[in-house]
């Protein structure tokens, strides 16, 4: 666990045990400040040559409970004339994120870390033309 | 807390206190299985009309300790001829993710949830032309 500090203030803590049971404060600390709004325009989803829509995914047993997932609007990209270009494909950019899932029936409440693959937006790539043998 | 079960197995647990101190198993459960590799082609970063590079961001006091961040290669998009198109901008798609940050000097180790804005990939948008007054 690279999360264990090099100075290891708790030298007797076994890394494998440590990983299985750590205390977490789930009150979100906002280290981003005002940077978020200014750095992240939300209109790209409409203005992109590979536009996308966002779908609401809610799971009350997950932290965060609500995740908005992208889906490409078209299979192709939109050209300067607003028409679909059949030589260019609109593809989903996905990111693997970590979420916390509540362990069923746990008391006191415990969570496990789970990987989740989410669509974040779309980009435009040239179609790969398969050559006949 | 929507993580609290319907039957509220711990009825005396105050929701506000609950958020501040939960137990988490940091051993990642991969609910994605083999889907990850098949669903996430890594060549989009080169084939896109708005290509990007990935930079390694490591923080030993963070979970996950390694995060790969995207940066757009060009300010403009690449057209079918491989030239930069000055009417089209390459823009970074960012996502807000949650990471765990170790509380300094905590023993046993405790973490807080922190927001992080990461670049995931790039997309191509039409330049907005500002009209003169």
């Amino acid at each position: 666990a690279a999360i264990i500090p090099q100075s290891s203030a708790c030298p007797n803590t076994e890394a494998k045990d440590f990983l299985q049971n750590v205390k977490v404060n789930l009150k979100v600390f906002n280290s981003l400040g005002a940077k978020v709004s200014s750095r992240r325009p939300s209109d790209y989803l409409n203005r992109s040559t590979s536009p996308w829509t966002l779908h609401r995914n809610e799971d009350p047993d997950r932290y965060p409970s609500v995740i908005w997932e992208a889906q490409c609007r078209h299979q192709r990209c939109v050209n300067a004339e607003g028409k679909l270009d059949h030589h260019m494909n609109s593809v989903l950019i996905q990111q693997e994120i970590l979420v916390l899932k509540r362990e069923p029936e746990s008391c006191p409440f415990t969570f496990r870390v789970e990987k989740m693959l989410v669509g974040v937006g779309c980009t435009c790539v040239a179609s790969i033309v398969r050559q006949a043998a | 807390a929507a993580i609290i079960p319907q039957s509220s197995a711990c009825p005396n647990t105050e929701a506000k206190d609950f958020l501040q101190n939960v137990k988490v198993n940091l051993k990642v459960f991969n609910s994605l299985g083999a889907k990850v590799s098949s669903r996430r082609p890594s060549d989009y970063l080169n084939r896109s009309t708005s290509p990007w590079t990935l930079h390694r961001n490591e923080d030993p006091d963070r979970y996950p300790s390694v995060i790969w961040e995207a940066q757009c290669r060009h300010q403009r998009c690449v057209n079918a001829e491989g030239k930069l198109d000055h009417h089209m901008n390459s823009v970074l798609i960012q996502q807000e993710i949650l990471v765990l940050k170790r509380e300094p000097e905590s023993c046993p180790f405790t973490f807080r949830v922190e927001k992080m804005l990461v670049g995931v990939g790039c997309t191509c948008v039409a330049s907005i032309v500002r009209q003169a007054a």
Partner: antibody, heavy 121, light 106 residues
Framework: QVQLQQSGAELVRPGTSVTLSCKAS????????IHWVKQTPVHGLEWIGV????????FYNQKFDGKAELTADKSSSTAYMELRSLTSEDSGVYYC??????????????WGQGTSITVSS | QIVLTQSPAIMSASPGEKVTMTCSAS?????IYWFQQKPGTSPKRWIY???ELASGVPARFSGSGSGTSYSLTISSMEAEDAATYYC?????????FGGGSKLEIK
């Protein structure tokens, strides 16, 4: 303290559009979704839809899809709802309310004071 | 859509009396939320996630239930409790509200 300040009452003509605003203060705007709810004596409380200021995502109750458009401006911490092609059926009080994205357990915890819309010729 | 039926629609209680109102869902839901509304004001979150009292709500209020049957109880009615109470579900789209239970003081 948390506040959702809504725009004032409107008397509008049938067939026109109106935009309602909901200015948030006292919390991090992008940590919460903004949901909109309509109240009338006949239909009671009806959920219109949700806007996520962080991502720009929107989701609507099918009944209001095409009638309402939800947007948000992160720089001013303000959410908006445009109501189009107004008829007398659209008269009522409209509320904005916030919903924590990270923990849905809490539900819609703070509500604006409401905006009364009267559609009449 | 899930229909929430509240009963009784109107009720009155004397100070000190125990009050129970119910909310029945047309399909099973995970949680119920209760809002209190007084004339001319916006709804206030009163009970969330079936059991939890919102900040400032007196301890004489409680919530219970599961599946399709939920209730809000006031152990000892007080004049300030006179209001309309709405139940709400967000387990299934579209999110819906009950028609309300109007509680009056005798």
């Amino acid at each position: 303290q948390v506040q959702l300040q809504q725009s004032g009452a409107e008397l509008v003509r049938p067939g026109t559009s109106v935009t309602l605003s909901c200015k948030a203060s006292g919390y991090i705007f992008t940590d919460y979704e903004i949901h909109w709810v309509k109240q009338t004596p006949v239909h009671g409380l009806e959920w219109i839809g949700v806007n996520d200021p962080e991502s720009g995502g929107t989701f609507y109750n099918q009944k209001f899809d095409g009638k309402a458009e939800l947007t948000a401006d992160k720089s001013s911490s303000t959410a908006y709802m445009e109501l189009r092609s107004l008829t007398s059926e659209d008269s009522g009080v409209y509320y904005c309310t916030r919903y924590y994205r990270y923990e849905s357990f809490y539900g819609m915890d703070y509500w604006g004071q409401g905006t009364s819309i009267t559609v009449s010729s | 859509q899930i229909v929430l039926t509240q009963s009784p629609a109107i009720m009155s209680a004397s100070p000190g009396e125990k009050v129970t109102m119910t909310c029945s869902a047309s399909s099973s839901i995970s949680y119920i939320y209760w809002f209190q509304q007084k004339p001319g004001t916006s709804p206030k979150r009163w009970i969330y996630a079936t059991f939890e009292l919102a900040s400032g709500v007196p301890a004489r209020f409680s919530g219970s239930g599961s599946g399709t049957s939920y209730s809000l109880t006031i152990s000892s009615m007080e004049a300030e409790d006179a209001a309309t109470y709405y139940c709400h579900q967000r387990s299934s789209y579209p999110w819906t509200f009950g028609g309300g239970s109007k509680l009056e003081i005798k």
